[in-house]
């Protein structure tokens, strides 16, 4: 059997026998274009492609449409994988989305969506989610039905107020909605009563800015 040399996601890497968490090179579907991603091979059976991570505020998430499209940051630390890659990947097969959250009091929670995909750039990378389970709230903190993606230079939300400029970060803002995992990072003891922080309302309420977040995807049939 010929050894697979290109991988479209971390699940393929895991199944090839590479089962250590770390940075791997992925290839865009139907292309030779490559992208580096962090693969979590430990959580829930492994094979997770990390598409977003926050942990310390070291990376500025108030970025342009182009930067969110192509990705930014470091896969070893805080980063955004890139809307274009995620859109292409999730448009080919059915993926689940797991969101892991940490607060400043030592608690952890997660939300799991059993079907996740991003529409293409022509639809502003609109998010589609179904089948919520998990411990981070019984109601989805990502507004349903899914919103278009907005950044500081591309306002596609449902509010006249330009949510990305007001709240910081690119996100699937509604008007503006119950979440923003790409908001301003606030350190401990400065993380409450913040309108523009890292927010997941149906777990921690409004004004609470989280300590750490990870968004990761994996094929539903893994």
């Amino acid at each position: 059997k010929e050894e697979q040399t290109t991988f479209r996601d971390c699940a393929e890497i895991f199944k090839s026998g590479l089962t250590t968490s770390g940075i791997y090179t992925l290839t865009f579907p139907n292309s030779t274009e490559e992208i580096k991603a962090y693969c979590d091979m430990d959580v829930g059976g492994g094979g997770w492609t990390v598409i977003q991570h926050r942990e310390d505020g070291s990376v500025d998430f108030q970025r342009t449409w182009k930067e969110y499209k192509e990705g930014f940051g470091s896969p070893l630390g805080e980063y955004w994988l890139g809307n274009e890659f995620v859109s292409q990947l999730t448009g080919q097969h059915r993926y689940v989305l797991k969101i892991q959250l940490k607060d400043w009091e030592g608690n952890e929670a997660h939300s799991l969506y059993d079907h996740f995909y991003l529409a293409g750039e022509e639809s502003n990378y609109r998010i589609h989610l179904t089948g919520l389970t998990g411990t981070a709230g019984k109601i989805s903190s990502i507004s349903q039905p899914g919103s278009d993606f907005s950044t500081k230079d591309s306002d596609n939300d449902k509010c006249i107020c330009k949510c990305s400029q007001m709240l910081s970060g690119g996100w699937w803002f509604d008007a503006c909605g119950p979440s923003n995992l790409n908001g301003q990072y606030y350190p401990q003891k400065q993380n409450t009563n913040k309108f523009n922080g890292i927010k997941w309302y149906y777990w921690k309420g409004s004004g609470y800015s989280l300590k750490a977040t990870t968004m990761m995807i994996r094929p539903a049939d893994f």
């Epitope: 449902k158 008007a175 309108f195």
Partner: nanobody, 131 residues
Framework: EVQLVESGGGLVQAGGSLRLSCAAS????????IGWFRQAPGKEREGVSC????????TYADSVKGRFTVSSDNAKNTVYLQMNSLKPEDTAVYYC????????????????????????WGQGTQVTVSS
Amino acid sequence: EVQLVESGGGLVQAGGSLRLSCAASGFTLDDYAIGWFRQAPGKEREGVSCISSSDGSTTYADSVKGRFTVSSDNAKNTVYLQMNSLKPEDTAVYYCAAGLRGRYYRGTYSLVCAPYEYDFWGQGTQVTVSS
């Protein structure tokens, strides 16, 4: 420091009235939208009525339209909720909260009145409506 203090709650018979007050300090009403929200046991917190003092716009939940009236007194930095024709289903803890002004739905220009858009909260006041 932003502070919101609610008062005026209590026990009232169905059909009666109450007037809730929300005294704000640490900011001026013109800079924020103020919302009244309520939470009944075992239920999610819900928007009742919101007001933006800077332009006078208001919004109401369908369940209270025609019965509740929100108003503000900028000189006293206080927002009021006049509640008439109260029903047992209005029983809840009522909270006032402040959020950034300027949040209006595109197209309808109606003020957003969802609890997740409001970041500073009071401690709440209990309203009980007996039948």
